[in-house]
């Protein structure tokens, strides 16, 4: 089990096993670290982080987002529409990590490890939500057909797309791990 | 004195199944953590999957989910890998390890060859 | 597999040598990293924890440093025994990764 960590997060070389939720926390921590280290370079390539014609490619995406109704959030919290509303979220999000695969120079091992790390996440959440039948698993063929959508994109939308994937992944995880820590 | 002693290795064709044994001694089992790596040969070293002390909790790297399980016997000891659906891509020398994030005690290894 | 940046990929020493291997991480991990020994035809040995915490039995002349995304192996004076191939391991996150190795071999 990864090891317990002080305030500070640094690795104590004495430790007592994780909890469930404890890991879980750590492994999104680690996931949003991953996605600062490629916003850097989307940040750097190109000036999309300071674009204000996001809302234009937002619309053609359907990113997971948290609304009020998912239960997530603190007025209205709801701790297992909330949890069906985060495994649904990062397997909806899947598509998007595929399509960043190809989308990134110098940080490719690091958007493969991104991706990775967040099918272990999924399956850290799944065990979390065993009893819970309402999760649904995005339909195969219409992500195939999202993946070649994207692909065919103009370069200054691909851009602005892996831009939009990444705020929104992060923000998605964010709101996930406050919800989680109420659970 | 910590002993791992990983045993089921051998020449399996590809699509057959096979499971792994790693028996251990010198340490309290239950409270530790165990994970599978794997080694192909000539190559470097790969992480397969963790099951929790209890066994109750099991996760595993992505291009072994959905093919291999991990599990344990506590009352004997005893750490399992059940592969199934193996590639030729599969074929490795496979270690269990004590798993406290980092591995501080490791099998000797058992190779696994997946070929027709 | 994803693997961290882990170099050289090889290198020739002597013994007596002062012999400094270097492990990137992907992104900031702390200090979640360890080192191994690894010979040929045998396991992976522990060599060093939590970035600069020497395993239990392993020789003094052996340490590590580092924290965030860059760190460091020495071995202060090469001895004939530690010709090996070397790997660094993050575990701040799952999949745990492993660097590609570093081979030490004899000048």
């Known amino acids: 089990v990864p090891p317990g960590e002080d305030s500070k997060d640094v690795a104590a070389p004495h430790r007592q096993p994780l909890t469930s939720s404890e890991r879980i926390d750590k492994q999104i921590r680690y996931i949003l670290d991953g996605i600062s280290a490629l916003r850097k370079e989307t940040c750097n390539k190109s000036n999309m982080c300071e674009s204000s014609k996001e809302a234009l490619a937002e619309n053609n995406l359907n990113l997971p987002k948290m609304a009020e109704k998912d239960g997530c959030f603190q007025s209205g919290f709801n701790e297992e529409t909330c949890l069906v509303k985060i495994i649904t979220g990062l397997l909806e999000f899947e598509v998007y990590l595929e399509y960043l695969q190809n989308r990134f120079e110098s940080s490719e091992e690091q958007a493969r490890a991104v991706q990775m790390s967040t099918k272990v996440l999924i399956q850290f959440l799944q065990k979390k939500a065993k009893n819970l039948d309402a999760i649904t698993t995005p339909d195969p063929t219409t992500n195939a057909s999202l993946l070649t959508k994207l692909q065919a994109q103009n370069q200054w939308l691909q851009d602005m797309t892996t831009h939009l994937i990444l705020r929104s992944f992060k923000e998605f995880l964010q709101s996930s791990l406050r919800a989680l820590r109420q659970m | 004195y910590y002993q791992l002693v990983e045993s089921g290795g051998g020449l399996v064709q590809p699509g057959g199944s096979l499971r792994l044994s790693c028996a251990a001694d010198g340490f309290l089992f239950s409270g530790y953590a165990m994970s599978w790596i794997r080694q192909a040969p000539g190559k470097g070293l790969e992480w397969i999957g963790q099951i929790s002390g209890s066994g109750g909790s099991t996760v595993y790297n992505y291009n072994v989910l959905g093919r291999f399980t991990i599990s344990r016997d506590n009352s004997k000891n005893t750490l399992y890998l059940q592969m199934n659906s193996l590639r030729a891509e599969d074929t490795a020398v496979y270690y269990c390890?004590?798993?406290?994030?980092?591995?501080?005690?490791w099998g000797q290894g058992t190779l696994v060859t997946v070929s027709s | 597999n994803i693997q961290k940046t882990q170099s050289p990929s090889s290198l020739s020493a002597s013994v007596g040598d002062r012999v400094t291997i270097t492990c990137r991480a992907l992104w900031h991990i702390s200090s979640y990293l360890a080192w191994y020994q690894q010979k040929p035809g045998k396991a992976p040995k522990l060599l060093i924890y939590a970035a600069s915490h020497l395993h239990y039995g392993v020789p003094s002349r052996f340490s590590g440093s580092g924290s965030g995304t860059d760190f460091t192996l020495t071995i202060s004076s090469l001895q004939p025994e530690d010709f090996a191939t070397y790997y660094c391991q993050q575990y701040s996150g799952l999949p745990y990764t492993f660097g590609q190795g570093t081979k030490v071999e004899i000048k």
């Open positions: 390890a004590r798993d406290t994030g980092y591995f501080d005690h």
